[in-house]
């Protein structure tokens, strides 16, 4: 599996999509897990509804949500209020029995918020009358890792 990179801005929401063959994975629940180390286990973060027919219902675990379009074949994960510690390698999974097939490997990268005055330096940020409170910006940039790129730093 190639790894797809999704970039999001700290404090905002990031939406990750995982396409799959809807017939091949018919009837199977899905999950989103976080890879612990390069060869470590993938720790379950959140999974779709226990009843596959209700997979379209959004399920939350903390700030992470999952929903599955089982007809269209797209699993969508939303990471709300993205934080630097959310960066890392994840997997979208299709569950059968106690086993899981990897649908997509995802590298989440968290970019500093250019409007955050703690890091902004001389960057402009809004004053009291220019608040973005009502804005719901979902920033998602994705790309595939280039050959030779590694999602984890090499270990000695």
């Amino acid at each position: 599996h190639n790894t797809t990179v999704f970039q999001g801005v700290a404090g905002q929401s990031l939406q990750v999509s995982c396409p799959y063959d809807s017939m091949k994975h018919w009837g199977r629940r899905k999950a989103w897990c976080r890879q612990l180390g390069e060869k470590g286990p993938c720790q379950r973060v959140v999974s779709t509804h226990n009843l596959w027919l209700l997979s379209f219902l959004r399920r939350w675990n903390g700030s992470t949500a999952i929903t599955d379009d089982t007809l269209g074949g797209t699993l969508t994960i939303t990471l709300r209020n993205l934080q630097p510690h959310d960066a890392g390698l994840y997997q979208c999974q299709s569950l059968h029995g106690s086993e899981a097939d990897t649908l997509r490997k995802v590298l989440v990268e968290v970019l500093a918020d250019p409007l955050d005055h703690r890091d902004a330096g001389d960057l402009w940020f809004p004053g009291e009358s220019e608040s973005f409170e009502d804005a719901h910006v979902e920033h998602s940039i994705s790309r595939s890792l280039l050959e030779g790129e590694i999602p984890f730093p090499p270990t000695s």
């Epitope: 063959d21 017939m23 091949k24 018919w26 009837g27 009843l51 596959w52 029995g97 106690s98 086993e99």
Partner: antibody
Framework: EVQLVQSGAEVKKPGESLKISCKGS????????IAWVRQMPGKGLEWMGT????????RYSPSFQGQVTISADKSISTAYLQWSSLKASDTAMYFC????????????????WGQGTLVTVSS | DIQMTQSPSSVSASVGDRVTITCRAS??????LAWYQQKPGKAPKLLIY???SLQSGVPSRFSGSGSGTDFTLTISSLQPEDFATYFC?????????FGQGTKLEIK
């Protein structure tokens, strides 16, 4: 009506190659996994492996990995099981079976079976 | 691999009897278990899936129960056509594995 029809009985000599088939009809063949199951004379059932004809994704039991090859041609709704060099111990009945995922529990079970192909390997 | 152990290996019973066959998994498999019936010279037939769900077209005298490691198949009132060999199979993980079979014979 869902049907899996397997090729006829085969008598072979050790070292010979063989390819048996399983043709599906009455359903969307490329949308269901097809498994192969071995039953040696008077014995139980052994899962050999499975293939998804839609993209030829294949999984093997460690006991059969490297011993057989599972393939499929979705254009003619047929799955295959082949050996490059048969042994006397390959003498058995071979069944193909459709794997159906039941959404109640997100796992799959063998809901339709072929009639079986008897393979006899003897010098 | 998960080992599936059936007991008894064979059982003799009469038409109208209630018969119970057990299947034990070497590790927990939740409810991911199926039961099949096989008659001589024929392919297996799915009876029960997900430990207790009756496959379409299977008579209601067949029932399944259990979860984790211990499972049972019960035939409430044996009919002449029920004399066959029965296999359990785990659908928890690959490779899929079957029990060794229980032969149900006429007493």
């Amino acid at each position: 009506e869902v049907q899996l029809v397997q090729s006829g009985a085969e008598v072979k000599k050790p070292g010979e190659s063989l390819k048996i088939s399983c043709k599906g009809s009455g359903y969307s063949f490329q949308s269901y996994w097809i498994a192969w199951v071995r039953q040696m004379p008077g014995k139980g059932l052994e899962w050999m492996g499975t293939i998804y004809p839609g993209d030829s994704d294949t999984r093997y039991s460690p006991s059969f990995q490297g011993q057989v090859t599972i393939s499929a041609d979705k254009s003619i709704s047929t799955a295959y099981l082949q050996w490059s060099s048969l042994k006397a111990s390959d003498t058995a009945m071979y069944f193909c079976a459709r794997q159906r995922t039941f959404f109640y529990d997100s796992s799959d079970y063998f809901d339709y079976w072929g009639q079986g192909t008897l393979v006899t390997v003897s010098s | 691999d998960i080992q599936m152990t059936q007991s008894p290996s064979s059982v003799s019973a009469s038409v109208g009897d209630r018969v119970t066959i057990t299947c034990r998994a070497s590790q927990g498999i939740s409810s991911w278990l199926a039961w099949y019936q096989q008659k001589p010279g024929k392919a297996p037939k799915l009876l029960i899936y997900a430990a207790s769900s009756l496959q379409s077209g299977v008579p209601s005298r067949f029932s399944g129960s259990g979860s984790g490691t211990d499972f049972t198949l019960t035939i409430s009132s044996l009919q002449p056509e029920d004399f066959a060999t029965y296999f359990c199979q785990q659908a928890d993980s690959l490779p899929r594995t079957f029990g060794q079979g229980t032969k149900l014979e006429i007493k």
